[in-house]
């Protein structure tokens, strides 16, 4: 019989206190006087003194109002002792359950919630979730069960109910069509949380819904027609800046313009880029324009965005009429580099060629000519006709001025425009070889022994070109053939000089005549040092001294 059922006590009781809750009773009180006491948190340990017991009657007392949100359940022990203090019962467990009262309002976890949703989404799309808490009990009562609702929406555009909220979870969703960032970029919702599952206390907060940009607006040219003037031949010249307006979010891919020349640029003369700040289309020349060929270009430019359109949108097109302005253009030699074959050594005053320039301009301008660079000073140019004549001896073999048979001259043409312009041309004279050089032996000094002499092989060179070179022929003159012999080898490009009679040690002149395939003859004196020696020698030995 020493038991007590769990005791339920409502929180926030108004008393009067102490308030009798239940009576502890031991059936041992028939035999002896019993004294009752309680222990545990809420009695003799913190929070002390909430509960007490009438020592002699066993009445369990509540001394003050309870707060379920602070302590929802107390676990105490009841004790029964006799007059002499001896325990007459085992300690008894006393459970006191604090029952809830709806004494707390819901509280939103934030004063302002922020969420976002893309403009133009389907109704039903989830936006964000809001949360409110309520300290009251939501398990055994509805005191802490929160129901969410939207109290108001600002602006009320295009409908006053663009959003809905899940009454239990606080999830906000789009409910209506017509979210348009360009009209309403942000909605402010006043949201409510009401306890008792919607029938109790209410609290409010704000949910701000940002409408995110979708590329649902096409960029539009403003104006759509342009006229521009560009000097001919200018490359990289800014022709025109094209302006567009786009209702989408500035500096976003849905706003940034992409330009495309759709037509009118057959020669690929123009290019268009987007200015990173202004979003304007900058039309420039990729190649020089030619006034004489075409003095007006009509371009058609289309504009889209970096981001694709989210729906089918009509694209805007601009028309740009580009007027090409005439400029005084430099005369152009035709061809820019002229190759002319001319025989070397032609007489002074002999014509070489006529080299003229054409003026791209339509007016009949007068062109005058002059030589700009003539390293050897061999040529003259008529200022009116462009006739080039020889004033010096053109020498193909002149290694200082001629490279690979070519003599390079730069000429200049000047028009009589205001201001005058000049153009240059290159004249490449390919000098045709003439047999104007005889063969020459190398070396022209030899050293030879007067006893058992070694044959001296001399290389034959000729500055001219074939066929004015080998095979060569050799002949000794001026009695040189008394002591020497000269024979050309089989290939005809070397001469072998041999001493055929004894000569005493000394230096001698050997007169050697060489002729080329075109019979051009060249006499060369070979200095021959004869030494007193046998066979091969490079320098004469000094006089022998005995010891």
């Amino acid at each position: 019989d020493w038991v007590v059922a769990p005791i339920s006590v409502p929180e926030n009781g108004k008393g009067p206190f102490p308030q009798r809750l239940n009576q502890l009773k031991s059936n041992k009180d028939r035999d002896t006087k019993i004294f009752y006491s309680i222990t545990g948190p809420g009695a003799d340990s913190p929070p002390e003194g909430v509960f007490a017991v009438e020592k002699e009657t066993g009445w369990l007392l509540l001394n003050k109002p309870l707060d379920r949100e602070e302590i929802a359940k107390y676990e105490l022990f009841g004790h029964a002792v006799s007059e002499n203090g001896a325990s007459v019962e085992d300690p008894m467990n006393i459970s006191i359950i604090v029952t809830d009262q709806n004494d707390h309002k819901p509280k939103f976890t934030q004063d302002t919630f922020r969420g976002s949703v893309l403009e133009g989404v389907l109704p039903g799309t989830s936006v964000m979730q809001v949360t409110a808490t309520d300290e009251d009990d939501a398990i055994y009562t509805y005191n802490g069960v929160v129901a969410y609702s939207i109290h108001s929406q600002e602006p009320k555009d295009p409908h006053d109910l663009m959003f809905t909220i899940h009454r239990s979870t606080g999830t906000i969703s789009v409910i209506s069509s017509g979210l348009d960032r360009e009209k309403v970029p942000e909605y402010t919702l006043t949201i409510q949380a009401t306890d008792m599952d919607g029938d109790g206390s209410t609290t409010t907060a704000v949910a701000v819904v940002e409408i995110l940009d979708a590329n649902d607006n096409a960029p539009m040219f403003d104006p759509q027609k342009y006229e521009a003037h560009v000097p001919e031949n200018a490359v990289g010249h800014e022709v025109q800046r094209l302006t567009v307006t786009d209702l989408d979010a500035p500096n976003s891919p849905a706003w940034r313009a992409t330009y495309l020349i759709m037509g009118g640029d057959d020669g690929d003369h123009f290019t268009i880029t987007t200015h990173p700040e202004s979003n304007q289309g900058i039309l420039t020349t990729r190649k020089g324009l030619d006034f004489e060929a075409k003095n007006q270009h009509t371009l058609y430019v289309e504009v889209t965005n970096e981001a694709p359109f989210v729906l089918k949108l009509p694209t805007s097109t601009a028309t740009i009429v580009v007027h090409v302005e005439d400029v005084n253009e430099a005369p152009v030699f035709v061809p820019p580099s002229k190759v002319v074959e001319v025989q070397e050594g032609i007489p002074t005053g002999e014509p070489v060629c006529v080299y003229t320039a054409e003026d791209p301009d339509k007016e009949n301008q007068k062109i005058s000519y002059r030589i700009l660079r003539d390293p050897a000073g061999w040529l003259a140019m008529d200022p009116d006709s462009g006739q080039v004549t020889a004033v010096g001896t053109l020498d193909r073999e002149d290694e200082q001025f001629v490279r690979n048979n070519i003599y390079e001259v730069m000429v200049l043409a000047m028009d009589n425009g205001s201001p005058p312009t000049t153009g240059t041309g290159t004249l490449l004279l390919t000098l045709i070889d003439v047999n104007d050089h005889g063969p020459v032996p190398e070396p022209r000094q030899i050293t030879i022994c007067n006893q058992s002499p070694v044959r001296q092989v001399l290389n034959i060179t000729d500055k001219d070109l074939s066929p004015h070179t080998s095979p060569f022929q050799a002949q000794l003159t001026d009695d040189s053939d008394i002591y020497w012999t000269a024979e050309v080898n089989e290939e005809g490009d070397t001469v072998v000089l041999s001493l055929k009679k004894f000569l005493k040690q000394d230096t001698y002149d050997v007169h050697l005549s060489l002729s080329d395939h075109g019979n051009k003859e060249q006499l060369t004196v070979i200095r021959a040092t004869v030494c007193d020696c046998h066979g091969h020698v490079e320098t004469c030995p000094g006089p022998w001294k005995g010891g």
């Epitope: 109704p123 799309t125 295009p158 409908h159 409910i175």
Partner: antibody
Framework: EVQLLESGGGLVQPGGSLRLSCAAS????????MSWVRQAPGKGLEWVSA????????YYADSVKGRFTISRDNSKNTLYLQMNSLRAEDTAVYYC??????????WGQGKMVTVSS | QSALTQPASVSGSPGQSITISCTGT?????????VSWYQQHPGKAPKLILS???KRPSGVSNRFSGSKSGNTASLSISGLQAEDEADYYC???????????FGGGTKLTVL
């Protein structure tokens, strides 16, 4: 008067394709999300697909995902449903309807699509 | 199996009143006040008769009314008339796809 008028239904073999159109009049078509709902013979209503007013956002029921494509041309005030790889279970009356404010209204008169060999 | 539960059929005599129930869950009917009712005559398209639980579109008779309690919505028709004989479908907005759930439909017979 607000009106939706479907066209393009008919008989098609399994695996075949069909395109339904829905011409809208009497309201600002581009301002409203649109949907397709179907009803198999003797059965209830099934939401098939939806598209936002701009056409930038779409939804498909699992049963048709990957086979059906919803689109719209706001310049022509017309909604489309391209149906590919059709199956016998796609046989139904197909309705177009405006979708918003948690409801479907108005509805077109419906077009019968029969998938049979 | 439909997401929302409706009785397969109800009947009533002319002049009587009937009620059709539509039971969902706390994520659809219970969560939002976006329950709609549609009337469908044989061979015709569905026609909206109630939206947002109890709002009648213009042109719909005031004999049709709606209510909601917890996870169950109801359609009431008073003063039954022969032309009320039709199939009635409820629908509810729901959190998450597919956003619209339909009931299986209720056949109303006017005796």
């Amino acid at each position: 008067e607000v009106q939706l008028l479907e066209s393009g239904g008919g008989l098609v073999q399994p695996g075949g394709s069909l395109r339904l159109s829905c011409a809208a009049s009497g309201f600002t078509f581009s301002s409203y999300a649109m949907s397709w709902v179907r009803q198999a013979p003797g059965k209830g209503l099934e939401w098939v697909s939806a598209i936002s007013g701009s056409g930038g956002s779409t939804y498909y029921a699992d049963s048709v995902k990957g086979r059906f494509t919803i689109s719209r041309d706001n310049s022509k005030n017309t909604l489309y449903l391209q149906m590919n790889s059709l199956r016998a279970e796609d046989t139904a009356v197909y309705y177009c309807a405006s979708w918003g404010d948690g409801t479907l209204n108005p509805w077109g008169q419906g077009k019968m699509v029969t998938v049979s060999s | 199996q439909s997401a929302l539960t409706q009785p397969a059929s109800v009947s009533g005599s002319p002049g009587q009143s009937i009620t059709i129930s539509c039971t969902g869950t706390s994520n659809d009917v219970g969560a939002y006040n976006y329950v709609s009712w549609y009337q469908q005559h044989p061979g015709k398209a569905p026609k909206l008769i109630l939206s947002e639980v109890n709002k009648r579109p213009s042109g719909v008779s005031n004999r049709f009314s709606g209510s909601k309690s917890g996870n169950t919505a109801s359609l009431s028709i008073s003063g039954l008339q022969a032309e009320d004989e039709a199939d009635y479908y409820c629908s509810s907005f729901t959190s998450g796809l597919p956003w619209v759930l339909f009931g299986g439909g209720t056949k109303l017979t006017v005796l």
